[in-house]
């Protein structure tokens, strides 16, 4: 299995409002070179949730240290979940390009559902 595969194991994750949601994703290879991004939804209207390369994403933290050499785990945690966060999240590998990076492979998605906050 030489070609990079995206491992996005959970089909569904359920989180109570106010809690954090962990979305798991890993790659089977470091090649090709290029960033990982997380999106909510698919297609043209998808929403960028996290970009490994650039940007400020105050509610998102990486589960593993992404600067660590040979790291293949690109799981993220999203804090203070609200019902508006519900949707399907995709972990996407991009290939470094010029001028723009090119989408290379996507995970199969993880559906995030939000439960009411326990009283």
């Amino acid at each position: 299995e030489d070609e990079l595969q995206v491992i996005q194991p959970e089909k569904s994750v359920s989180v109570a409002a106010g809690e954090s949601a962990t979305l798991r994703c890993a790659m089977t290879s470091l090649i090709p070179v290029g960033p990982i991004m997380w999106f909510r939804g698919a297609g043209a209207g998808r929403e960028l949730i996290y970009n490994q390369k650039e940007g400020h994403f105050p509610r998102v933290t990486t589960v593993s240290e992404l600067t660590k050499r040979n790291n293949l785990d690109f799981s993220i945690s999203i804090s203070n979940i609200t019902p508006a966060d519900a949707g399907t999240y995709y972990c996407v590998k991009f290939r470094k390009g010029s001028p723009d990076d090119v989408e290379f492979k996507s995970g199969a998605g993880t559906e995030l559902s939000v439960r009411a906050k326990p009283s």
Epitope: E1, P9, K11, R24
Partner: antibody, heavy 123, light 113 residues
């Protein structure tokens, strides 16, 4: 072709622990899930938990939480299942199995199984 | 946890006849993003580990004879052996692969009448 070879039969005393190994050969190890399933004599199949070595952390059935530990050693392509505080009801055949993975990283079923390890708990 | 209920517990069928096993899940195992049902069927013969027969509710694993077929969606599934052979005597299990823990049905024993 991937093969899973498990460690041999064990006889244990109540209250003790058992650690069963599962060595994979013939394929990639780190990006596949390894699940553990047990089967008590004359009973059905019971999923205990699984690990995807690339993530390192395991996922357990609530029933076994706190009593089972699943680990993986990527350097030897070996998964381990340790069950503690053994009781007679833990007498069973314990299987490891590799979870088949589709494009995009979802798992769909256990496509390769170990031969099973019989654990007998008796005083 | 998703509860998987299989019926019947046992089934005796004449050689060459059809065998039908049902499996019901307590909640849907259909993943809407790819329209796949994460439901697997296994065959287990005495003294052997289980063998994967069908995944995604209806996709036969490589090498599985075409007399085995799976159908259903959402919460209701069926495994059919179209023409029972002597080597099909075994216990059959369904398992949902949608949400952890990946629970099994209780099993259906298929025998020859």
């Amino acid at each position: 072709q991937v093969q899973l070879v498990q460690s041999g039969a064990e006889v244990k005393k109540p209250g003790s622990s058992v650690k069963v190994s599962c060595k994979a050969s013939g394929g990639t190890f780190s990006s596949y899930a390894i699940s553990w399933v047990r089967q008590a004599p004359g009973q059905g199949l019971e999923w205990m938990g699984s690990i995807i070595p690339i993530f390192g952390t395991a996922n357990y059935a609530q029933k076994f939480q706190g009593r089972v530990t699943i680990t993986a050693d990527e350097s030897t392509s070996t998964a381990y299942m340790e069950l503690s505080s053994l009781r007679s009801e833990d007498t069973a055949v314990y299987y490891c199995a590799r979870d088949g993975r589709e494009y995009g990283g979802h798992y769909y079923g256990m496509d390769v199984w170990g031969q099973g390890t019989t654990v007998t708990v008796s005083s | 946890d998703i509860v998987m209920t299989q019926s019947p517990d046992s089934l005796a069928v004449s050689l060459g006849e059809r065998a039908t096993i049902n499996c019901k899940s307590s909640q849907s195992v259909l993943y809407s993003s790819n329209n796949k049902n994460y439901l697997a069927w296994y065959q287990q013969k005495p003294g052997q580990p289980p063998k994967l027969l069908i995944y995604w509710a209806s996709t036969r694993e490589s090498g599985v004879p075409d007399r085995f077929s799976g159908s259903g969606s959402g919460t209701d599934f069926t495994l059919t052996i179209s023409s029972l052979q002597a080597e099909d005597v075994a216990v059959y299990y369904c398992q949902q692969y949608y949400l952890s823990p990946f629970t099994f049905g209780g099993g259906t024993k298929v025998e020859i009448k």
